[in-house]
């Protein structure tokens, strides 16, 4: 379930759910909604400072790069 | 048990740059968040930014125009600066971590350096 | 102004029960972002006291505890003693700011 998650784990969660894709602590500028909530909010914003669940953590993974063709 | 010590100097003329370190003792920079906390005398407690030691920063709106935090995870050292600095911004600076036991509370802290912004 | 609103001062007789309250609004309290409360005497650096609404840091005694609802948190304190006499402050998140907002502070004075 949602649980807090602040420093190294933070990380580590990110790590884990992410791969070799890697992360963003802040999400990529365009990201999603144009409404959203403050531009500052990171991901330490939303899972140090309340719950959060693998579906959010995953919104802080860098986009898969396309494979080029053999 | 993380310790935290500020230091710095205790005198700051009008329109320079405040200058203070944290020396952490007892846990790595790279493991917590670490915060600067300010109370001017006889106030309550306004919070200045914290940061990661991977570069992630958030600083109080009000203040981030003259903010800046830095790490040196070499010295196990964090610090602050604020320019331009005025009257208002005399007041006792606590340095802060979140060690991540506590959901986002801030659980250790410096004892608090002093700091007067007078000519 | 703080974003968050305390009571300036409080007062009990020892033995007795104090709350202190601390309201907030929707983009803090009211978003699910958690509540810390600190304790602090005259001179020295501020303790946390009570972590994530209602959870104590070990060290701390039982007579201090923490609830949240809505947009509003408290932290009561039960068997007043003549030690519990100092400041105490709520902290959270808020999202409209990007930051970390503290209450004013609530100043607890031991009758007697």
């Known amino acids: 379930g949602p649980e807090t998650l602040c420093g190294a784990e933070l990380v580590d969660a990110l790590q884990f759910v992410c791969g070799p894709r890697g992360f963003y602590f802040n999400k990529p500028t365009g990201y999603g909604s144009s409404i959203r909530r403050a531009p500052q909010t990171g991901i330490v914003d939303e899972c140090c400072f309340r719950s959060c669940d693998l579906r959010r953590l995953e919104m802080y993974c860098a986009p898969l790069k396309p494979t080029k063709a053999a | 048990q993380v310790q935290l010590q500020e230091s710095g100097p205790g005198l700051v003329k009008p329109s320079e740059t405040l200058s203070l370190t944290c020396t952490v003792s007892?846990?790595?920079?790279?493991?917590?968040?670490w915060s600067w906390i300010r109370q001017p005398p006889g106030r309550g407690l306004e919070w200045i930014g914290y940061?990661?030691?991977?570069?992630?920063?958030n600083y109080n709106p009000s203040l981030k125009s003259r903010v800046t935090m830095s790490v040196d995870t070499s010295k196990n050292q964090f610090s602050l600066k604020l320019s331009s600095v005025t009257a208002a911004d005399t007041a006792v600076y606590y340095c802060?971590?979140?060690?991540?036991?506590?959901?986002?509370?801030?659980?250790?802290w410096g004892q608090g350096a002093t700091v007067t912004v007078s000519s | 102004q703080s974003v968050l609103t305390q009571a300036p001062s409080v007062s009990g007789a020892p033995g007795q029960r104090v709350t202190i309250s601390c309201t907030g609004r929707s983009s803090n309290i009211g978003a699910g972002y958690d509540v810390h409360w600190y304790q602090q005497f005259p001179g020295t650096a501020p303790k946390l006291l009570i972590y994530g609404n209602s959870n104590r840091p070990s060290g701390v005694p039982d007579r201090f505890s923490g609830s949240k609802s809505g947009t509003s948190a408290s932290l009561a304190i039960t068997g007043l003693q003549a030690e519990d006499e100092a400041d105490y402050y709520c902290?959270?998140?808020?999202?409209?700011?990007?930051?970390?907002?503290f209450g004013g502070g609530t100043k607890l004075t031991v009758l007697g």
């Open positions: 902290q959270s998140y808020d999202s409209s700011l990007s930051g970390s907002v």
């Open positions: 007892g846990g790595s920079i790279s493991s917590y968040y």
């Open positions: 802060a971590c979140i060690t991540g036991t506590t959901k986002g509370g801030m659980d250790v």
């Open positions: 940061f990661f030691y991977s570069g992630y920063t």
